[in-house]
Interface confidence: low
């Protein structure tokens, strides 16, 4: 009476051993097919046939110009990316059976997207702007406006803003102020200028002195012997032709106009490096 249930238990165990429960999940680098776990194909190989109870998974290496970069059950390998020269692309790194080709752009060009499917020419920074960051194969030129004290007079994908010339360090004076597009223009400190300017300054001072003396004399001169009641001070009108009173400005202006203006040595107008085709 007791043997039958025992036999049933034993048969149950035996049946379980021969026909295990179909797995619902497989180990890493395996896949579930027809209720059994098969090995995935390694990178660089494609699936030819699934495993069976009696055979292993069959895989074949990818052909030329093909790849598979993961453990897979793909029946076809992927074609290597083609770096199309007509789009400005070139191979940065060749593809292998396990990796795709990496494209980049020709020199002077950069990718239009992260996938680098086509290229565009690096932009140039206009006059008044300098290159903050030179373009790479994947990023465009970054420009920045030239700050005070700096200039850029060319359109370039390479040149930074250049500092204004320091006239003082060359014993010159600034004759024309710089802008963000132009350098300062330096000129010589002429002795002639000094010889003319100094007498003019003395002339002006002498004229002022004369005026002061004249005022004092007019103020002291008694107009009536009889005592007068307290008067309001009168406005004094100075004659227009007083010596030296109006000579400084025209002389100064003329001299300034005749002053030679020189471009400093070594600061010729910059010419941009020819951009690539």
């Amino acid at each position: 009476m007791v043997r039958l249930p025992l036999q049933c238990v034993l048969w149950g165990c035996l049946l379980t051993a021969v026909h295990p429960e179909p797995p619902t999940a497989c180990r890493e680098k395996q896949y579930l097919i027809n209720s059994q776990c098969c090995s995935l194909c390694q990178p660089g190989q494609k699936l030819v046939s699934d495993c069976t109870e009696f055979t292993e998974t069959e895989c074949l290496p990818c052909g030329e110009s093909e790849f598979l970069d993961t453990w897979n059950r793909e029946t076809h390998c992927h074609q290597h990316k083609y770096c199309d020269p007509n789009l400005g692309l070139r191979v940065q790194q060749k593809g292998t059976s396990e990796t795709d080709t990496i494209c980049t752009c020709e020199e002077g060009w950069h990718c239009t997207s992260e996938a680098c499917e086509s290229c565009v020419l690096h932009r140039s920074c206009s006059p008044g702007f300098g290159v903050k960051q030179i373009a790479t194969g994947v990023s465009d030129t970054i420009c920045e406006p030239c700050p005070v004290g700096f200039f850029s007079n060319v359109s370039s994908a390479f040149e930074k803003c250049h500092p204004w010339t320091s006239c003082e360090t060359k014993d010159l004076v600034v004759q024309q102020a710089g802008t963000n597009k132009t350098d300062v223009v330096c000129g010589p400190q002429d002795r002639l200028r000094a010889l003319v300017v100094i007498p003019i300054i003395f002339g002006i001072l002498f004229a002022i002195l004369l005026v002061l003396v004249f005022i004092k004399k007019v103020a002291k001169k008694p107009t009536n012997k009889a005592p007068h009641p307290k008067q309001e001070p009168q406005e004094i009108n100075f004659p227009d032709d007083l010596p030296g009173s109006n000579t400084a400005a025209p002389v100064q202006e003329t001299l300034h106009g005749c002053q030679p203006v020189t471009q400093e040595d070594g600061k010729e107008s910059r010419i941009s490096v020819q951009e690539r085709q």
Partner: antibody, heavy 121, light 106 residues
């Protein structure tokens, strides 16, 4: 039969100019990139320039940049090399070569017989 | 500028294997071609894209390329293989040739 035939070589004085031509036959000329390669007497191969198949993108060796110009006329199946400001060091046999594909991946699979350029006063 | 370095000469006995190397910075990332040139003749491509053999080139010619070195291998070298061999790669918008190796079959 795939064939490349160069012409236009000769003796020229320093500073002078020459135009080399390369007539192609036996293949679809417009589908392939083309190169010029030179070889100075007793020296190795030196690449000069390449032009791709249709857009006409061109590249040059630093030694000839600004002096030489590569061009092609697909309607005439002809490749050209305009050489200006020639120097003594440009003396060489100039080969025209067909790239194995539309660009540089495939190697130069067909070469002409070469044309000799001599720069001397 | 980029340079490809080859040994000036390699000697091999008939029937032996000849190996000609070509080295350059990260050369394995670039496609390499090999050319054979016999005296008075134009060059002929024997290997392209590192290891591919054009039709008409004997199977004894093979190529590999990884790291900083590309190698042209000629197994069962014959007297007719005596020639100059040049490696070539495309590097950032220019084509670069190695200096050439003279293969002598003893």
């Amino acid at each position: 039969e795939v064939q490349l035939v160069e012409s236009g070589g000769g003796l020229v004085q320093p500073g002078g100019s020459l135009r080399l031509s390369c007539a192609a036959s036996g293949f679809t000329f417009s589908s392939y990139a083309m190169s010029w390669v030179r070889q100075a007497p007793g020296k190795g191969l030196e690449w000069v320039s390449i032009i791709n198949n249709n857009v006409g993108r061109t590249y040059y060796a630093d030694s000839v940049k600004g002096r030489f110009t590569i061009s092609r006329d697909n309607s005439k199946n002809t490749l050209y090399l305009q050489m200006n400001s020639l120097r003594a060091e440009d003396t060489a046999v100039y080969y025209c070569a067909k790239e194995g594909g539309d660009y540089y991946y495939y190697g130069m699979d067909v070469w002409g017989q070469g044309t000799t350029v001599t720069v001397s006063s | 500028s980029y340079e490809l370095t080859q040994p000036p000469s390699v000697s091999v006995s008939p029937g032996q294997t000849a190996s000609i190397t070509c080295s350059g910075d990260k050369l394995g990332d670039k496609y390499v071609s090999w050319y054979q040139q016999k005296p008075g003749q134009s060059p002929v491509v024997v290997i392209y894209q590192d290891s591919k053999r054009p039709s008409g080139i004997p199977e004894r010619f093979s190529g590999s390329n990884s790291g900083n070195t590309a190698t042209l291998t000629i197994s069962g070298t014959q007297a007719m293989d005596e020639a100059y061999y040049y490696c070539q790669a495309w590097v950032s918008s220019t084509v670069v040739f190695g200096g050439g190796t003279k293969l002598t079959v003893l």
